[in-house]
Interface confidence: low
């Protein structure tokens, strides 16, 4: 058993029907010595008496808020949460496996640049009685500071019969060094509590591996005289690291007909303009990627040929 | 050329070669389904590689003030990786495919290090750790880890030379 925060404790349990469970001793936080009774959750039934209460925690029925009273007055509370270990593996019931980029991916993180700011998000089908707390650091043995905000509900989607809820959090490395080559990964730890169930999820990554630039901005077409060709131009997204001579992007320009089946013409360039043939009813799209490190491409920025 | 005395390197040549290094490093080890090699316990393997750190002056401001610190660090790393790619980690079993880009990568590392330090001038180089994995599968894993680490290193080097070519060339 360990303390998650004041008056909230996590009991780690091997989870199978005839598991012996954990013996937990609760102590009433009071100078009083006698006349103390205990209840669990909202029941009026007394579980035991005395300054300490020993309970065998075997399943969720034994978790909850234990309250000690004296003469009708509440003295203190201890909330017991359970952390289940099934066949040697900690449970992951609260969050959905996003399966991208690999199985057992519960947290996904992205950064728009090298400033040390990144966003992580996760999915759940649970709508109520749910709390998250996020901690992060650079490295684990001698951790350097990363400050994370509060996790917030960022999206709701309907998936078949189920509603899916997306939560996200923004974090910022305290002393980021955008130009350095990372040697220690960022560690992100999310504590999740649903009713009386506690789970924790972790992710470890280098900022360079989670970079996904915003799409190029100010995408414009300039027709070339007496030609079907157009000059496409664009700019670096505002959120990309500067100076651009140092933090350079490479671009992919695509001409796509109205029909998805039509052949796509693609041009790769390090410049912020390109000359392409603009077909009728086609659209021109441009996306960006770090020029020197193959992290994710940005989403497409698009304009119609007409 | 980045002579230890302090004259400027051939920024544009270095830029071109370092960008080629980036391409080669990624073609030698593309992102295999985002294979997370950090899970494979890399303490003793890639911890000793020279990293371009915050105080090495490889940021735009540091390059403007004095590019020599950064270039020395890059040179150190190039020599280190060049030796690793020439070691039995890459030459031993399982043999690399004949068309593997590792050979080109090895040659380009050497080429860039020579651009930075011509014959007769010497910067301190870092000792290469004695890594001799016994099993072919260990060697394979180590190759992946070294290439992943090299990708990060050459990305920073390429940024340095691109910025130098754009802002510091005579």
């Amino acid at each position: 058993i360990w303390e998650l925060k004041k008056d909230v404790y996590v009991v780690e349990l091997d989870w199978y029907p005839d598991a012996p469970g954990e013996m937990v001793v609760l102590t009433c936080d009071t100078p009083e010595e006698d006349g103390i009774t205990w209840t669990l959750d909202q029941s009026s039934e007394v579980l035991g008496s005395g300054k300490t209460l020993t309970i065998q925690v075997k399943e969720f029925g034994d978790a909850g808020q234990y309250t000690c009273h004296k003469g009708g007055e509440v003295l203190s509370h201890s909330l017991l949460l359970l952390h289940k270990k099934e066949d040697g593996i900690w449970s992951t019931d609260i969050l959905k496996d996003q399966k991208e980029p690999k199985n057992k991916t519960f947290l996904r993180c992205e950064a728009k640049n090298y400033s040390g700011r990144f966003t992580c998000w996760w999915l759940t089908t649970i709508s109520t009685d749910l709390t998250f707390s996020v901690k992060s650091s650079r490295g684990s043995s001698d951790p350097q500071g990363v400050t994370c905000g509060a996790a917030t509900l960022s999206a709701e989607r309907v998936r078949g019969d189920n509603k899916e809820y997306e939560y996200s959090v923004e974090c910022q490395e305290d002393s980021a060094c955008p130009a350095a080559e990372e040697s220690l990964p960022i560690e992100v730890m999310v504590d999740a509590v649903h009713k009386l169930k506690y789970e924790n999820y972790t992710s470890s990554f280098f900022i360079r591996d989670i970079i996904k630039p915003d799409p190029p901005k100010n995408l414009q077409l300039k027709p070339l005289k007496n030609s079907r060709q157009v000059e496409v131009s664009w700019e670096y997204p505002d959120t990309w690291s500067t100076p651009h001579s140092y933090f350079s992007l490479t671009f992919c320009v695509q001409v796509q007909g109205k029909s998805k089946r039509e052949k796509k013409d693609r041009v790769f360039t390090d410049k912020t303009s390109a000359t392409v043939i603009c077909r009728k009813n086609a659209s021109i799209s441009v996306r960006a990627q770090d020029r020197y490190y193959s992290s994710s491409w940005s989403e497409w920025a698009s304009v119609p040929c007409s | 050329r980045a002579v230890p005395g302090g004259s400027s390197p051939a920024w544009t040549q270095c830029q071109q070669l370092s960008q080629k290094l980036c391409t080669l490093a990624w073609s030698a080890h593309p992102l295999v389904g985002h294979m997370d090699l950090r899970e494979e316990g890399d303490e003793e393997t890639t911890n000793d590689v020279p990293h371009i750190q915050c105080g090495d002056g490889c940021d735009p401001q540091g390059l403007r003030d004095n590019s020599q610190f950064c270039l020395q660090r890059i040179h150190q790393g190039l020599i280190f990786y060049e030796k690793l790619l020439g070691s039995d980690i890459f030459t031993g079993e399982p043999s690399l495919l004949p068309d593997s880009p590792v050979g080109q990568l090895h040659a380009s590392l050497l080429g860039l290090s020579q651009l930075l330090q011509p014959e007769g001038h010497h910067w301190e180089t870092q000792q290469i750790p004695s890594l001799s994995p016994s099993q072919p599968w260990q060697r394979l894993l180590l190759r992946f880890k070294i290439l992943r680490s090299l990708q990060a290193f050459v990305a920073v080097a390429a940024r340095v030379f691109a910025h130098g070519a754009a802002t510091l060339s005579p």
């Epitope: 199978y16 029907p17 005839d18 | -």
Partner: antibody
Framework: QELKESGGRLVTPGGSLTLSCTAS????????MTWVRQAPGKGLEWMGV??????LNYASWAQGRFTISKPSSTTVDLKMTSLTTEDTATYFC??????????WGPGTLVTVSS | DVVMTQTPSSTSAAVGGTVTIKCQAS??????LAWYQQKPGQPPKPLIV???ILTSGVPSRFKGSRSGTEYTLTISGVQREDAATYYC?????????FGGGTELEIL
């Protein structure tokens, strides 16, 4: 998300029968799986449980003649031997009978008659 | 094995009335107690787990409580759709037993 029992049929006294419980769209791995039966017009009878780690527990009256097994991650079987007319009942399988998300199959009817 | 003694075996109530069903465990079973509702031709449906915790979607007129080894299901403001047989399920985490059932008729 459902459980479905199968294998119920008419058997003669002294015969044997194996019932299967198949899960679709849900996981059994993290749960205990229980077999319960109900004779026509009578109450529910708890028979036995197979735990996550494969631990087996039976009601004392069910010990010996009934065997629960888990041949795969999506199926749980109940093997019944030396059947008597008293064993005529609807047999249910249930996932996690003590948990709020307990799921039960619709039941399968076993008739023991000569 | 734990023996669960359920009373009464049948009861009736008018719409809006209150019904109380009790289960006595032969030994201490902590929170290993659930209440089930069964309608003809259907599998049982869990109403309350952990002696007093209402399961998702169950109306708040159903209430479970526990005193020592006696467990009580109270239905306040009975509705027509509550006509069913109610069972308690209790155990020690290893072996369990159902109570004999209580048939509720709505007058």
């Amino acid at each position: 998300q459902e459980l479905k029992e199968s294998g119920g049929r008419l058997v003669t006294p002294g015969g044997s029968l194996t019932l299967s419980c198949t899960a679709s769209g849900l996981t059994l791995g993290s749960y205990s799986m229980t077999w319960v039966r109900q004779a026509p017009g009578k109450g529910l009878e708890w028979m036995g449980v197979i735990g996550v780690g494969g631990t087996l527990n039976y009601a004392s009256w069910a010990q010996g003649r009934f065997t629960i097994s888990k041949p795969s991650s999506t199926t749980v079987d109940l093997k019944m031997t030396s059947l008597t007319t008293e064993d005529t009942a609807t047999y249910f399988c249930a996932r996690g009978t003590y948990s709020g998300d307990s799921i039960w199959g619709p039941g399968t009817l076993v008739t023991v008659s000569s | 094995d734990v023996v669960m003694t359920q009373t009464p075996s049948s009861t009736s109530a008018a719409v809006g009335g209150t019904v109380t069903i009790k289960c006595q465990a032969s030994q201490s079973i902590s929170s290993w107690l659930a209440w089930y509702q069964q309608k003809p031709g259907q599998p049982p449906k869990p109403l309350i787990v952990r002696a007093s915790i209402l399961t998702s979607g169950v109306p708040s007129r159903f209430k479970g409580s526990r005193s020592g080894t006696e467990y009580t299901l109270t239905i306040s403001g009975v509705q027509r759709e509550d006509a069913a047989t109610y069972y308690c399920l209790g155990g020690d985490g290893h072996v369990s037993n159902f109570g004999g059932g209580t048939e509720l008729e709505i007058l």
